[in-house]
């Protein structure tokens, strides 16, 4: 019967008595930077070309005995997970292996850099179809390794890496912390994060998604027909590299940004038990388990968005945090979150010709996060309209006044330390969907976009007194682009998007002694693109 | 995932006012920085990736590497250029004493220097 991990990533329509989804990634080449591999293992023979690249440190210890099967173990298994005949994800993908890890599974940042450079030079000498680079390794945070990954990604290569097996924040490791890399954590058959001895999968905002990574059956270097079960974030990353190969084989023109958005979109949502993660990391860690798309084509009509969290600002009075979208993505909204509730909101601002989301800490606050909603919106023209604090009136308002521009997100930023001490009622006029409304002492920022066929609507859900969390979701066919809270008073900790749901967090009424006039409303802006939908229908 | 992220150490070695002879002074006001792995057991002191500014050509990378070797030799230090990078990042990999870091950070075109470190199969 089909191994659990292949079943988990397979949409129901492909599940027969065996795993054989259409097109096994045959147009794609997957580079594997790992140990040496047994390339003539029955599972992978003819699928893996061993390059002559080798850059590894000496093995530790004077009595180290180099046993071929041990030297090849890690790489052979991963090659099998990516493209193995019987237990592989992308059975049609061809692979090239580079040896950057020694027989003890140890390598160097410099050796990995030289390997990445080798791939880039190979790509220039002999351009082929789409390239996926699998990096099933991790070291401490490395500016240079992250920079090299960024350059390779900007050259059109998809990089997939292991989040790390240290039960720690993936942002402390490289290449896991590189924004351009698709970073993969590991889950088990019960959709629990994988425990590995006393440690386990890494987590946090630098993880893009999770994938099967425990008891994964794959090629064993012990013999040419042997299989073995291995666990780790390397195995998880290999699944995503395989899925990426299949997606790129079906749609070779996909950019890295489009591929990442699709991986997120087609993932199983909210199936991971978050209690395993440290409390402060739960909100930052994506609750996504990778899966193949239900059909290899036809996803183009959707408006894809993802949530990007910034690093923590730190606690100083003027501290700020910045969340950025990828180069091909549009920032459609910006929100902020602080565990202490002491924050001074957020704003969208231009930086290097691109909009970024900046959140502001407040005096006495433990720090803030900026949360960007990053979307794929072809031919978009977006701008930010700002209204300064209204002071005397009921509230500050700003709307999208340009013809054909629609509101995709609202942000508010204030200079006063605590809006909670100024409590005028905030009225939200009905029938004006293109308008952002906020506190009279806050400046309000509206993200206004023009794109072919783009339409948006506002959805609200309010509760009389704060109960920790208010949510509002966009319905089927619509995509959440903006998430904010009304009003911006002190008991609101912030707002953020989780998949297609806008979450507004606030302090419990029991701890704040709030009154019912402090009703908290979650405001979602839901958009869709008629243009993308029509283009997709014309293709079919 | 941010580049400015990470619990890693950044040591900025201040440039001395006196120049080193051969080396042209770096652009005014820019200070090359030194980075090393925050996890001590994973550090590999003695091998360094010297990363040069983005538009640096291969010939300039090679010239900078030779210059470092010459200046190190004058101080009685042996250095070995292990690899010259081009194609992804401009720079070079050098085996040298950590005593030479201050000197290396003053070289023209240098953006930052990172001490080599270990990576592991996951």
């Amino acid at each position: 019967s089909i191994p659990w991990n292949l079943e988990r990533i397979t949409p129901p329509r492909y599940r027969a008595d065996e795993y054989q989804p259409p097109d096994g990634g045959s147009l794609v080449e997957v580079y594997l930077l790992d140990t040496s591999i047994q390339s003539d293992h029955r599972e992978i023979e003819g699928r893996v070309m061993v390059t002559d690249f080798e850059n590894v440190p000496e093995e530790d210890g004077t009595r180290f005995h180099r046993q071929a099967s041990k030297c090849d173990s890690h790489g052979t298994h991963l090659a099998g997970v990516v493209s193995g005949r019987d237990a592989g994800v992308a059975k049609g993908a061809s692979m090239r292996s580079l040896r950057v890890l020694n027989c003890q599974g140890k390598g160097t940042v410099s050796g990995t850099l030289i390997g990445l450079e080798f791939i880039r030079k190979s790509q220039l000498v002999q351009p082929v179809g789409p390239l996926v680079v699998l990096l099933p390794l991790a070291g401490g945070y490395s500016r240079v390794l992250n920079a090299a990954c960024q350059r390779l990604a900007r050259a059109g290569v998809v990089l997939v890496t292991a989040a790390g097996n240290f039960r720690d924040d993936a942002c402390l490791y490289s290449p896991a912390s590189a924004p351009e890399v698709i970073t993969v954590g590991a889950t088990n058959a019960q959709d629990q994060p994988v425990t590995l001895g006393t440690l386990g999968t890494n987590f946090g905002r630098c993880v893009d998604l999770f994938a099967p990574g425990e008891d994964i059956i794959g090629a064993s270097s012990d013999c040419s027909t042997c299989f073995v079960s291995q666990s780790g974030t390397s195995q998880a990353a290999a699944h995503v590299a395989g899925i990426a190969a299949m997606m790129l084989s079906a749609e070779p023109e996909l950019t890295l940004a489009e591929l990442r958005q699709r991986l997120i979109h087609f993932s199983a949502k909210d199936v991971i038990n978050e209690a395993w993660f440290p409390e402060d990391q739960r909100v930052l860690t994506p609750n996504l388990v990778a899966a193949l798309p239900p059909s290899t084509h036809g996803a183009g009509w959707q408006l894809f968005c993802r949530t990007v969290w910034s690093a923590h600002s730190g606690p100083t009075r003027m501290a700020t945090a910045i969340a950025r979208c990828a180069p091909d993505e549009e920032l459609l909204s910006c929100s902020s979150f602080s565990r202490s509730g002491k924050r001074r909101g957020e704003r969208m601002e231009a930086q290097g010709g691109k909009l970024v989301c900046r959140a502001h800490n407040a005096f006495g606050g433990e720090g803030v996060y900026a949360i960007a909603r990053c979307c794929l919106l072809p031919q978009a023209n977006c701008s930010v309209h700002t209204a300064p604090p209204a002071e005397a009136s009921m509230g500050t308002r700003v709307h999208c006044h340009q013809q054909g521009h629609v509101l995709t997100g609202c942000s508010s930023h204030w200079e006063v330390e605590d809006l909670g001490t100024h409590k005028p009622p905030v009225l939200r006029p009905r029938g004006q969907p293109n308008q952002c409304v906020g506190h009279r002492e806050a400046s309000i920022h509206a993200s206004c976009c023009h794109a072919p066929g783009l339409e948006c609507k506002v959805k609200e859900h309010g509760i009389p007194a704060p109960q920790g969390q208010v949510t509002v979701a966009c319905e089927e066919g619509w995509t959440l682009t903006g998430c904010s809270a009304l009003p911006g008073t002190s008991h609101v900790l912030g707002a953020y998007a989780v998949d297609n749901t806008c979450v507004v967090r606030s302090r419990d009424v029991s701890t704040t002694g709030s009154t019912s006039e402090e009703a908290v409303t979650a405001v979602a802006i839901c958009c869709r693109s008629r243009h993308l939908a029509q283009a997709s229908q014309e293709l079919q | 995932q941010e580049d400015e992220d990470g619990d890693y150490e950044e040591l900025v070695l201040a440039l001395r006012s006196e120049e080193d002879g051969l080396a042209e002074a770096p652009e005014h006001g820019t200070t090359a920085t030194f980075h090393r792995c925050a996890k001590d057991p994973w550090r590999l002191p003695g091998t360094y990736v010297v990363v040069l500014k983005e538009e640096t050509h291969l010939s300039q990378s090679e010239r900078t590497a030779r210059r470092l070797q010459a200046q190190a030799a004058r101080r009685g230090y042996l250095t070995k250029i292990l690899h010259v990078f081009h194609g992804l990042l401009p720079g070079f990999l050098v085996k040298m004493s950590g005593d030479l870091l201050e000197l290396a950070l003053k070289l023209p075109h240098v953006d930052y220097i990172e001490e080599d470190s270990s990576v592991f199969a996951q």
Partner: antibody
């Protein structure tokens, strides 16, 4: 193009040994093993075993265990199959094929065992 | 390792379709995707026609197709032509080895 070229026909006495060679060209020799398959006159195909061109490991069919030795020489991209203690029922055409996938075959070597 | 079971002979007229079955067990055909089909003309080496159940190597006519259900694999040849007359063998991985079918002689009438 990918080719496997085998050595010429052999006539052997019962109890003797035969060593058949198979020279590979047109691909990376160590990326595949070599399978050996035989076919007795008027009979079907019979898989004898496999040898790794990467590390020399072997996987023999139980029937030939102890009587067959398969080796490779990566310097010449050549695989060898030696069958010992020959009997008359070992008379067959012996084929080498690329890997377990057996996507490319040699032209065959006829081995006749006769007293 | 006992051979996979194939019919000894199959007959078909030009233009017709024929199917050759290959029955194994849950330890070979049923367990692996790696079922191949070979064509052998008299005095010639076998030629791979289908691999991994249903994939056709480049250069092989699309008249040849493969499938699998449970422990039985099948080779279908549509639009029979005179040059299709040959012996056909299936093969499958087993947990440690390879196993062939006994062979099927296809006669084009």
């Amino acid at each position: 193009q990918v080719q496997l070229v085998q050595s010429g026909a052999e006539v052997k006495k019962p109890g003797a040994s035969v060593k058949v060679s198979c020279k590979a060209s047109g691909y990376s020799f160590t990326s595949y093993g070599i399978s050996w398959v035989r076919q007795a006159p008027g009979q079907g195909l019979e898989w004898m075993g496999w040898v790794s061109a990467y590390n020399g490991n072997t996987n023999y069919a139980q029937k030939f265990q102890g009587r067959v030795t398969m080796t490779t020489d990566t310097s010449t991209s050549t695989a060898y199959m030696e069958l010992r203690s020959l009997r008359s029922d070992d008379t067959a055409v012996y084929y080498c094929a690329r890997g377990y996938v057996m996507d490319v075959w040699g032209q065959g070597t006829t081995v006749t065992v006769s007293s | 390792q006992s051979a996979l079971t194939q019919p000894a002979s199959v007959f078909g007229s030009p233009g017709q379709s024929i199917t050759i079955s290959c029955t194994g067990t849950s330890s070979d055909v049923g367990a692996y995707n790696s079922v191949s089909w070979y064509q052998q003309h008299p005095g010639k080496a076998p030629k791979r026609m289908i691999y991994e159940v249903s994939n056709r190597p480049s250069g092989v006519s699309n008249r040849f197709s493969g499938s699998k259900s449970g422990n039985t694999a099948s080779l279908t040849i549509s639009g029979l032509q005179a040059e299709d007359e040959a012996d056909y063998y299936c093969s499958s991985y087993t947990s440690t080895n390879m196993v062939f079918g006994g062979g099927t002689k296809l006669t084009v009438l």
